[in-house]
């Protein structure tokens, strides 16, 4: 299994959104995507998953567009504050 | 909206080539992956594959691997699909439909192929 | 590969009459969808999500299950339900189609 975030850093101005990608490899037929902040204070904090076989995700500001086939979960930060400011990290999980 | 526009068909000899394209519009192209899907009476619906345009990985059903290629050209919004070697088996109506996740909302008119001597 | 199998083949009905089809999986899946053809058109999104009916589908069409057994109802059926309906997944690494059922308005 791997993933993969090419984006090192992305800069955008508030009240816009933000599109952050996420290509990963499985052999798995069922799993999860899942997004998470890392606060200054390294803490991870959940935001949103997307099951391998579920509608796309949606949670307040954030969404997923996700490209089953070609193995891409992309989160997408609507209505940027200063708050979303951080590193942001996907995971696969079964 | 969304459309799918896609080309003409087409009558073609055995063991040659052919390139199928599916002009989209009516939405951020990059943005969904573009299936093809063929319809014959014995088999009825399979998955061919499929293209991310954004990036252009493909994925393909193991049975069209070597059969269809799949490629995507952002500048026009069109997606392209090639079939190689073509034998009568290949002869059908082919589709192209917009993926959403999981979903297939929007299909193309098809195309037909005929493979004849 | 999931195989999908749909029963009847063939479906044959009165307007007004009730009338459910059926698809089974060979593993269980998450969700089913279902599509609508009639001849010489492309498939038509018609239910996903296993029971949401997709834009403009009338809402006497309702579909249910779960793991291996989907079903496709028609509560009432009129005259321009004629079709083929398909049911496909997307819970395996490829997504597959089930062979359809004709419904057939008398």
């Known amino acids: 299994q791997k993933v993969t975030q090419a984006q090192s850093s992305v800069s955008m101005p508030v009240r816009k959104a933000v599109t952050l990608n996420c290509l990963y490899e499985t052999s798995w037929w069922s799993y999860y995507i899942f997004w998470y902040k890392q606060l200054p204070s390294k803490e991870m904090i959940f935001l949103i998953r997307q099951g391998s076989d579920e509608q796309n995700a949606k949670s307040g500001r954030y969404s997923v567009n996700f490209k089953k086939a070609a193995k891409s979960v992309a989160l997408t930060i609507s209505a940027l504050q200063l708050e979303d400011s951080a590193k942001y990290f996907c995971a696969l999980g079964e | 909206q969304v459309q799918l526009q896609q080309s003409g068909a087409e009558l073609v000899r055995p063991g040659a080539s052919v390139t199928l394209s599916c002009k989209a519009s009516?939405?951020?192209?990059?943005?969904?992956?573009m299936h093809w899907v063929k319809q014959t009476p014995v088999h009825g619906l399979e998955w061919i594959g499929a293209?991310?345009?954004?990036?252009?990985?493909?994925a393909y059903n193991q049975k069209f691997r070597g059969k269809a290629k799949l490629t995507a050209d952002k500048s026009s919004s069109t997606v392209y699909m090639e079939l190689r070697s073509l034998t009568s088996e290949d002869s059908a109506v082919y589709y192209c439909?917009?993926?959403?996740?999981?979903?297939?909302?929007?299909w193309g008119q098809g195309t037909l192929v005929t493979v004849s001597a | 590969q999931i195989v999908l199998s749909q029963s009847p083949a063939i479906l044959s009905a009165s307007p007004g009459e009730k009338v459910t089809m059926t698809c089974r999986a060979s593993?269980?899946?998450?969700?089913i969808h279902w599509f609508q053809q009639k001849p010489g058109s492309s498939p038509k999104f018609w239910i996903y999500?296993?029971?949401n009916l997709a834009s403009g589908v009338p809402a006497r069409f309702t579909g249910s299950g779960s793991g291996t057994s989907y079903s496709l109802t028609i509560s009432r059926v009129e005259a321009e339900d004629a079709a083929t309906y398909y049911c496909?997944?997307?819970?395996?690494?490829?997504?597959?189609f089930g062979g359809g059922t004709k419904l057939e308005i008398k």
């Open positions: 439909t917009r993926g959403y996740g999981i979903q297939f909302p929007y």
């Open positions: 009516g939405y951020r192209f990059p943005d969904y992956e």
């Open positions: 293209i991310d345009p954004e990036t252009g990985r493909t």
């Open positions: 593993s269980s899946v998450s969700y």
């Open positions: 999500g296993t029971s």
């Open positions: 496909q997944q997307w819970s395996s690494d490829s997504p597959t």
